[in-house]
């Protein structure tokens, strides 16, 4: 599944049907390049964009509407979490209900928890409305257990 990396400014199309994939972490340009041995934390995030309407264009990744919305959302998340331990996002899906957005966020393990993922997204909602003209509501964040994610032991220095 194509992925938006925190270290890249260019965006690629994301399938609306595939499940979340592991970002290719070795592409990251962080000073301490994250490797799978360090571990990755995944979070599933969904939210409503209440000022947009869902239509069939959001089921087709080749349409302008799909690509523009995906680009805005990808840029928004790169703004919210910047870099630090943010590795990228994948598996953006659009659903009916105004527009419901579902995606998976990947972070360097041990650098953030589910509460702070949600907090920082909620803190950015006002800016998202002005910068991207997206009115965001009904934010929900949950942990995604991945069997290959290294178990938390000693913390990653921050």
């Amino acid at each position: 599944t194509p992925t938006t990396l925190a270290s890249h400014s260019t965006k690629t199309d994301a399938s609306s049907t595939h499940h979340s994939s592991v970002p290719p972490l070795t592409s990251s340009n962080h000073s301490t390049s994250p490797q799978l041995s360090t571990g990755v934390s995944f979070f599933f995030l969904s939210f409503h964009i209440s000022n947009l309407q869902f239509n069939s264009s959001l089921e087709d990744p080749s349409t302008d509407y799909y690509q523009e919305l995906q680009r805005d959302i990808s840029e928004m998340f790169l703004q919210i979490y910047k870099q630090g331990g943010f590795l990228g996002l994948s598996n953006i899906k659009f659903r009916p209900g105004s527009v419901v957005v579902q995606l998976t966020l990947a972070f360097r393990e041990g650098t953030i928890n589910v509460h702070d993922v949600e907090t920082q997204f909620n803190q950015y909602k006002t800016e998202a409305a002005s910068r991207y003209n997206l009115t965001i509501s009904d934010v929900s964040v949950s942990d995604v257990p991945f069997p290959f994610s290294a178990q938390s032991g000693a913390g990653v220095p921050g």
Partner: antibody, heavy 119, light 107 residues
Framework: QVQLVQSGAEVKKPGSSVKISCKTS????????MNWVKQRPGQGLEWIGQ????????NYNGKFKGRATLTADKSSSTAYMELSSLRSEATAVYFC????????????WGQGTLVTVSS | EILLTQSPDFQSVTPKEKVTFTCRAS??????IHWYQQKPNQSPKLLIK???ESISGVPSRFSGSGSGTDFTLTINSVESEDIADYYC?????????FGQGTKLEIK
């Protein structure tokens, strides 16, 4: 290894300004938030604000807005905090501290800079 | 603004004793609490992140627990080198805030 080295102690007169530096090494300066924390003598810790050197994005504690200005120089991997219109209450040790995100914890701290405001 | 209240303000213990510090948040913050140790004339040092996650290089006698509004930092067997101030910090909301601190003294 990650290092944050702050500038030396300053003595300033009320109403003046001071600019403190925090020179970093051992990591990609642009990719992490730099925070500033105040500690008055014998008192606790108070978060002033933060800057993301990659694009200059800043967040401030409302209490310090207008009095503290955060900047960063990517070429020298140095963060700065300027405090203006100094009053006696600004007498404190100021720390820089690195974090992964806007809201986070601080594993790396500078050694602190004592600013004394006295006439 | 989230207010963090630490108790007690001072704690006096004998070496090898178990000590517990508490931090209470003015509203629920999940597990977004972090603990620091600050020795005299030094910078704070991160001990525990996200309420209970250990930090590389920090002695195993330090542990944390709690969620919601009530959190604890425990030192299982106090050593003389643990004389310091201990602060909690929340990252659940802006502005980031710290507790007022607890001073640990050795009898």
């Amino acid at each position: 290894q990650v290092q944050l080295v702050q500038s030396g102690a300053e003595v300033k007169k009320p109403g003046s300004s001071v600019k403190i530096s925090c020179k970093t090494s051992g990591y990609a300066f642009s990719n992490f938030w730099m925070n500033w924390v105040k500690q008055r003598p014998g008192q606790g810790l108070e978060w002033i604000g933060q800057i993301y050197p990659g694009d200059g994005d800043t967040n401030y504690n409302g209490k310090f807005k207008g009095r503290a200005t955060l900047t960063a120089d990517k070429s020298s991997s140095t963060a700065y905090m300027e405090l203006s219109s100094l009053r006696s209450e600004a007498t404190a040790v100021y720390f820089c501290a690195r974090s992964y995100y806007r809201s986070a914890w601080f594993a790396y701290w500078g050694q602190g800079t004592l600013v004394t405001v006295s006439s | 603004e989230i207010l963090l209240t630490q108790s007690p303000d001072f704690q006096s213990v004998t070496p090898k004793e178990k000590v517990t510090f508490t931090c209470r948040a003015s509203q629920s913050i999940g597990t977004s609490i972090h603990w620091y140790q600050q020795k005299p004339n030094q910078s704070p040092k991160l001990l525990i992140k996200y309420a209970s996650e250990s930090i590389s290089g920090v002695p195993s006698r330090f542990s944390g627990s709690g969620s919601g509004t009530d959190f604890t930092l425990t030192i299982n067997s106090v050593e003389s080198e643990d004389i310091a101030d201990y602060y909690c910090q929340q990252s659940n909301n802006w502005p980031l805030t710290f507790g007022q601190g607890t001073k640990l003294e050795i009898k």
